[in-house]
C-alpha cells in the first residue's frame, strides 16, 4: 500500500451530548479549506443512544461500553474510513453529571473514566470527556444558533436563510431547556451585567460581544417535576397526591426513595409516614401553574432585577431561539408556530391538561406513556419559566422562536463546543488566508 492519500477536502467532527436523560451523538462536516468561514459547518447525522443518561450507569459502569457501541459504529459508517483517525471526538456531560458530582466526585470521575476508556477504543481522534459548566452550556448554545443563523457573518444579505431571520446582525438570545438544567443567554442592550458570574466577553469575527448567561441547575423539566412533587407531598394528608399537572384519571406510584435521590429535592426532604405515594391526576392548568410558581423564589433580589432565586437577569432584549426541550415539548403540543400568541398557548394548555388520561392515551397511541403523561406538566412549566421566571410578556412572546434545527443542524450547545475546541471561530474577521490559531477564542 502507499502512504496516506492527501486528506479529503472535507473534515468531520463528533460531539457526544451526555445529557441527564439520554446521550446523543452528533456528526459535523465542513470543507477543509473554509474552516474559518462562518456558517460552513453543518450536521450530517444525529444518533440517539438507546438508554438513559450516563449518570444512571453509576452502579453499572461496565455497561457503558455496550451502551455507546451502536452510535459509535454509526459514526464509523457515516465518516469515510480514510478520515477516522483525523476526526476529533468530544464528549460533554451536562447537568445530570453535575448533580452526580455534587453527590460524589468519586462516582462522577469513575463514570467519566469508563466513558473515556470506551471512546478511546475507537479509531477516532478522541479528545476527552468532561463535565461542561452551566456557563459553557449557555455560551455554546448561543454560539451555535448565531453561527447557524449567520449572525457572525459581516456580509449583510438581502435574502433570509431561515424564516425568522432578520437581516440585521443583532444576535439571537438562546433559551435551552434540558432535563436537569435550563440556560438563558443573550446580549443585553447597553446594560451592565451586575453579576460577574453571569458575564461573558467574546471577540468573534472581529466584533466584541458582552453576553449575559445563567444556568439554573435543578430547573430542567425532569428535575423541576421532582422538585414540585417533593414540595407538594410535604402537605399531602396521606399517600395520595392529587396533582393538577397530570391528566384526570392518571395514576402513578412513586417511591419516596426515588423522590429524594436527587440533590434537587433536598430542600423539600422530610420524613414521611409512607415509602410510596400515588399521584392521581386532576388536570388543572391554573392550579398546576400556581404549584410550579412556588419553585421560583422571587421574594429576594440583591440586584436591580432578578429572574428568580436571587439570580440577576437584565431586561430581555431582541429575539430568542428556544431549543432542546423547549422545542420538543412545544412541538408535541403543536405550539411552535410564530402565529400562536401567548394567550392562545395558555388557552390550549388549559384544554390539553383537562383532557382525560384515557382519551390522551388513545389520541397519542404511538407515544410512550412515561413521556405522554408529562407533557401537561412540561408545557405548563415552560410557560411558567418563560413568563414568571424570565419575565417574558404577552407582547415579547412573539420574540421567542421555538427552534428544532437551523439549516439542518440541531440547535444546542454541541456545535458551538466543537467550533471552539477545533479553533474554528476566529477572534478576527478572516482575511483571504486563515489567521494563526493564536487569535482564536
Amino acid at each position: 500500500t502507499q502512504n496516506k492519500a492527501l486528506p479529503e477536502n472535507v473534515k468531520y467532527g463528533i460531539v457526544l451530548d451526555a445529557g441527564s436523560s439520554h446521550t446523543s451523538l452528533y456528526i459535523y462536516k465542513w470543507p477543509a479549506e473554509k474552516e474559518n468561514d462562518t456558517g460552513v459547518v453543518h450536521q450530517v447525522e444525529e444518533c440517539r443512544v438507546k438508554g438513559p443518561g450516563i449518570s444512571k450507569f453509576v452502579q453499572k459502569v461496565n455497561e457503558i461500553g455496550i451502551y455507546l457501541t451502536d452510535c459509535m459504529e454509526r459514526a464509523r459508517e457515516v465518516i469515510p474510513r480514510s478520515q477516522h483517525q483525523e476526526t476529533p471526538v468530544y464528549l460533554g456531560a451536562t447537568a445530570g453529571m453535575r448533580l452526580l458530582r455534587m453527590e460524589s466526585e468519586e462516582l462522577a470521575d469513575r463514570v467519566l473514566d469508563v466513558v473515556e476508556r470506551s471512546l478511546s477504543n475507537y479509531p477516532f481522534d478522541f479528545q476527552g470527556a468532561r463535565i461542561i459548566t452551566g456557563q459553557e452550556e449557555g455560551a455554546y448554545g448561543w454560539i451555535t444558533i448565531n453561527y447557524l443563523l449567520g449572525k457572525f457573518s459581516q456580509k449583510t444579505r438581502w435574502f433570509s436563510i431561515v424564516p425568522y431571520e432578520t437581516n440585521n446582525q443583532e444576535t439571537f438570545g438562546a433559551l435551552d431547556l434540558g432535563g436537569a438544567s435550563t440556560q438563558v443567554t443573550f446580549v443585553p442592550q447597553n446594560q451592565t451585567i451586575e453579576s460577574p458570574d453571569n458575564a461573558l466577553q467574546f471577540r468573534l469575527y472581529g466584533k466584541d460581544y458582552n453576553v449575559y448567561t445563567h444556568s439554573f441547575l435543578c430547573y430542567g423539566k425532569d428535575q423541576a417535576l421532582w422538585q414540585k412533587l417533593a414540595k407538594d407531598i410535604q402537605v399531602a394528608s396521606n399517600e395520595i397526591l392529587r396533582d393538577p399537572c397530570f391528566h384526570p384519571g392518571y395514576k402513578k406510584v412513586v417511591n419516596v426513595s426515588d423522590l429524594y435521590k436527587t440533590p434537587c429535592t433536598k430542600r423539600f426532604e422530610m420524613t414521611l409516614p409512607f415509602q410510596q405515594f400515588e399521584i392521581q391526576g386532576i388536570g388543572n392548568y391554573q392550579q398546576c401553574h400556581q404549584s410550579i410558581l412556588e419553585l421560583f423564589n422571587t421574594s429576594y433580589c440583591p440586584y436591580s432585577q432578578c429572574a428568580f432565586n436571587g439570580i440577576f437577569l437584565p431586561p430581555l432584549q431582541g429575539d430568542f431561539g428556544a431549543f432542546s426541550a423547549f422545542y420538543f415539548v412545544m412541538k408535541f403540543l403543536n405550539l411552535t408556530s410564530e402565529k400562536v400568541s401567548q394567550e392562545k398557548v395558555t388557552e390550549m394548555m388549559k384544554k390539553f391538561c383537562a383532557q382525560p388520561w384515557e382519551e390522551i392515551k388513545t389520541s397519542y397511541a404511538g407515544v410512550k406513556e412515561k413521556y405522554l403523561s408529562e407533557y401537561c406538566f412540561s408545557g405548563t412549566y415552560i410557560l411558567s419559566l418563560l413568563l414568571q421566571g424570565y419575565h417574558f410578556t404577552a407582547d415579547s412572546w412573539e420574540h421567542i422562536h421555538f427552534i428544532g434545527k437551523i439549516q439542518g443542524s440541531d440547535a444546542g450547545w454541541t456545535l458551538g463546543y466543537m467550533l471552539n475546541l477545533t479553533n474554528m471561530i476566529p477572534a478576527e474577521q478572516p482575511l483571504s488566508t486563515p489567521l494563526s490559531h493564536s487569535t482564536y477564542v
Epitope: K4, R81, Q85
Partner: antibody
Framework: EVQLVESGGGLVKPGGSLRLSCAAS????????MNWVRQSPGKGLEWVGE??????????HYAESVKGRFTISRDDSKNTLYLQMNSLKTEDTAVYYC????????????WGQGTTVTVSS | EIVLTQSPATLSLSPGERATLSCRAS??????LHWYQQKPGQSPRLLIY???QSISGIPARFSGSGSGTDFTLTISSLEPEDFAVYFC?????????FGGGTKLEIK
C-alpha cells in the same frame, strides 16, 4: 525505503524485564499509530498493543494477556518505538514484530524482521 | 473479543489448482477483515485489506470476499511460491485478533 528494525531481544528469566526498540525510517514516524505483534514458536500471531499519536495524548491499548506488565512508548524525535516488558512469563517467549499501517488503520502493511525473546529459567 | 476461526487448518493442493481459504468471525465485523501470508523465517505480508481490497505488488490471483462474519481468500491458480501459512485478522475493534492460520502445502 520504508523500514522497521527491532532490537533488544534475548534470553531472560521468568519475572525479569526486557526493553525492545524499533527504529523506523522512510516515513514520517510521528504521523502513524504503531503496534507490536508477537508470534510464539510454531504458533499463530498475537497482537500485543498499540500506541497512538501525540495529538491522541499517546494513547495506548493492550491485549489482555500483557495488560499491566507491558508498556508501549514512542520517541518521535528519535523515530523509535519501545516495548517495556516486565514480570515476564514463559508464555511471553516469541518473536516480537514492530508493525504499522501506512494506509488507514488496524491492519499492518509494514513489518519489521522481528526480534526473539526467550523467557526461560 | 472477536474470535476468528480459520478453516481448514491445512490445505493440500497442487500448483495450478484453485485454493479457497475460509475465515469466520464470532460476531459481525462488516468488512474489517485483512489477510496475510507468512513464509518460514519471514515476517507476515499483507495480501488483502478490508475483505476485498487488493494491494499494489500483490499478484492478481489473490482475491478476497465476504462481509459480516464469513470471509474467503481465493488464490485462482496456485504458483509454487504461494505455499505458505495464511492468517486472517480482525481490524474492526480492539483487541485486534488473528485467526489460527491455514497452512497451504503442496500435495
Amino acid at each position: 525505503e520504508v523500514q522497521l528494525v527491532e532490537s533488544g531481544g534475548g534470553l531472560v528469566k521468568p519475572g525479569g524485564s526486557l526493553r525492545l526498540s524499533c527504529a523506523a525510517s522512510g516515513f514520517t514516524f510521528s504521523k502513524y499509530w504503531m503496534n507490536w505483534v508477537r508470534q510464539s514458536p510454531g504458533k499463530g500471531l498475537e497482537w500485543v498493543g498499540e500506541i497512538r499519536l501525540k495529538s491522541n495524548k499517546y494513547g495506548t491499548h493492550y491485549a489482555e494477556s500483557v495488560k499491566g506488565r507491558f508498556t508501549i512508548s514512542r520517541d518521535d524525535s528519535k523515530n523509535t518505538l519501545y516495548l517495556q516488558m516486565n514480570s515476564l512469563k514463559t508464555e511471553d517467549t516469541a518473536v516480537y514484530y514492530c508493525t504499522t499501517q501506512l494506509d488507514l488503520y488496524w491492519f499492518f502493511d509494514v513489518w519489521g524482521q522481528g526480534t526473539t525473546v526467550t523467557v526461560s529459567s | 473479543e472477536i474470535v476468528l476461526t480459520q478453516s481448514p487448518a491445512t490445505l493440500s493442493l497442487s500448483p495450478g489448482e484453485r485454493a479457497t481459504l475460509s475465515c469466520r468471525a464470532s460476531q459481525s465485523i462488516s468488512d474489517y477483515l485483512h489477510w496475510y501470508q507468512q513464509k518460514p523465517g519471514q515476517s507476515p505480508r499483507l495480501l488483502i485489506y478490508y475483505a476485498s481490497q487488493s494491494i499494489s505488488g500483490i499478484p492478481a490471483r489473490f482475491s478476497g470476499s465476504g462481509s459480516g462474519t464469513d470471509f474467503t481468500l481465493t488464490i485462482s491458480s496456485l504458483e509454487p511460491e504461494d505455499f505458505a501459512v495464511y492468517f486472517c485478522q480482525n481490524g474492526h475493534s480492539l483487541p485486534l485478533t488473528f485467526g489460527g492460520g491455514t497452512k497451504l502445502e503442496i500435495k
